[in-house]
């Protein structure tokens, strides 16, 4: 299973699409910055087995997919870019699911790291709460887009470490 290689390419494509999705000048949104508390420690550990690491990445992609699949998201972003982005994420999720099934046969470890997955879930809950509090304003979405780009970039470093471990 060569997930880290294929996922890294998919991650890069997703980042490019996210970068293209901007609709307003971010300079008008500085005062809307917010600390979402990205769970960095969940992407720092070397304690993960490959299947566990993939399940954490899977959760992050799944939550991102859910966030950008809402009707509020559809009302904000340019439809064709949003569709391409969702398709890219969906492809990554399918690749990961196939990879985890393959890896579980190799590893004698639990499939999921429950605490790490919960930390990722809570991170996205904070993002959703922020959007709700800001009434899904264009600037709130800009801040979230920037945050997701950052979290994708940070998870890319995690993936590269995972690939080096192989």
């Amino acid at each position: 299973c060569d997930l880290p290689q294929t996922h890294s390419l998919g991650n890069r494509r997703a980042l490019i699409l996210l970068a293209q999705m901007g609709r307003i000048s971010p300079f008008s949104c500085l005062k809307d910055r917010h600390d979402f508390g990205f769970p960095q420690e969940e992407f720092d550990g070397n304690q993960f087995q490959k299947a566990q690491a993939i399940s954490v990445l899977h959760e992050m992609i799944q939550q991102t997919f859910n966030l950008f699949s809402t009707k509020d998201s559809s009302a904000t972003w340019e439809q064709s870019l949003l569709e391409k982005f969702s398709t890219e994420l969906n492809q990554q999720l399918n690749d990961m699911e196939a990879c985890v099934i393959q890896e579980v046969g190799v590893e004698e470890t639990p499939l999921m790291n429950v605490d790490s997955i919960l930390a990722v879930k809570k991170y996205f809950q904070r993002i959703t709460l922020y959007l709700t509090e800001k009434k899904y304003s264009p600037c709130a979405w800009e801040v979230v887009r920037a945050e997701i780009m950052r979290s994708f970039s940070l998870s890319k470093i995690f993936q590269e470490r995972l690939r080096r471990k192989e």
Epitope: L30, K31, R33, A146, E147, R150
Partner: antibody, heavy 121, light 107 residues
Framework: EVQLVQSGAEVKKPGESLKISCKGS????????IGWVRQMPGKGLEWMGI????????AYSPSFQGQVTISADKSISTAYLQWSSLKASDTAMYYC??????????????WGQGTLVTVSS | DIQMTQSPSSLSASVGDRVTITCRAS??????LNWYQQKPGKAPKLLIY???SLQSGVPSRFSGSGSGTDFTLTISSLQPEDFATYYC?????????FGQGTKVEIK
């Protein structure tokens, strides 16, 4: 290692044009904005403007709007500050610094070494 | 524009002293305030961001506090290398603005 390396000192005459540079390395250049800060001799820091290298969107301080132009070439990870017609009052040290944009991260955490611009007839 | 006013503009202190510099914004800036240290002939160095977060690699004797309009930078025990000029800067909205600076000199 994150670095911002600025071009060397310049001595110019009033009315001349000038373009100074700031090259980023050791990080994703398009993931951060680049700001420019002026420091006149013996004075404090003044924010001039900022650029998002990913799309070259800019914002200027009203004090510097129309006086300078900020640009970037993401293919070579370089930001620029330029004047079309220098004045003696442009004599100063100019710094570039990176900014995390809309992310909750330290502002202006890395700075260039500065470019001294001297304008004298 | 948001005006930033630092006080004092200069102060004399001895090694080991506790030093406090204040910064006031002309309107509420939440916690969007940074503190920088600058030594002669050098670029500024970030010390504190978002009012109270210590930048990586900065000694723990430096601390920041405040929110809204009033902010403080404290050096708990002044060291010889701390003699420099300190600037506050608001990052709440454009145009970004700096305080006029506080020069910390040896008594």
């Amino acid at each position: 290692e994150v670095q911002l390396v600025q071009s060397g000192a310049e001595v110019k005459k009033p009315g001349e044009s000038l373009k100074i540079s700031c090259k980023g390395s050791g990080y994703s250049f398009t993931s951060y904005w680049i700001g420019w800060v002026r420091q006149m001799p013996g004075k404090g820091l003044e924010w001039m403007g900022i650029i998002d290298p990913s799309d070259s969107d800019t914002a200027y301080s009203p004090s510097f709007q129309g006086q300078v132009t900020i640009s970037a070439d993401k293919s070579i990870s370089t930001a620029y500050l330029q004047w079309s017609s220098l004045k003696a009052s442009d004599t100063a040290m100019y710094y570039c610094a990176r900014h995390p944009g809309l992310n909750w991260a330290p502002d202006f955490d890395y700075w260039g070494q500065g470019t001294l611009v001297t304008v004298s007839s | 524009d948001i005006q930033m006013t630092q006080s004092p503009s200069s102060l004399s202190a001895s090694v080991g002293d506790r030093v406090t510099i204040t910064c006031r914004a002309s309107q509420s800036i939440d916690r969007a305030l940074n503190w920088y240290q600058q030594k002669p002939g050098k670029a500024p160095k970030l010390l504190i961001y978002f009012a109270s977060s210590l930048q990586s690699g900065v000694p723990s004797r430096f601390s920041g506090s405040g929110s809204g309009t009033d902010f403080t930078l404290t050096i708990s025990s002044l060291q010889p290398e701390d003699f420099a000029t300190y600037y506050c800067q608001q990052s709440f909205d454009f145009p970004l603005t700096f305080g006029q600076g506080t020069k910390v000199e040896i008594k």
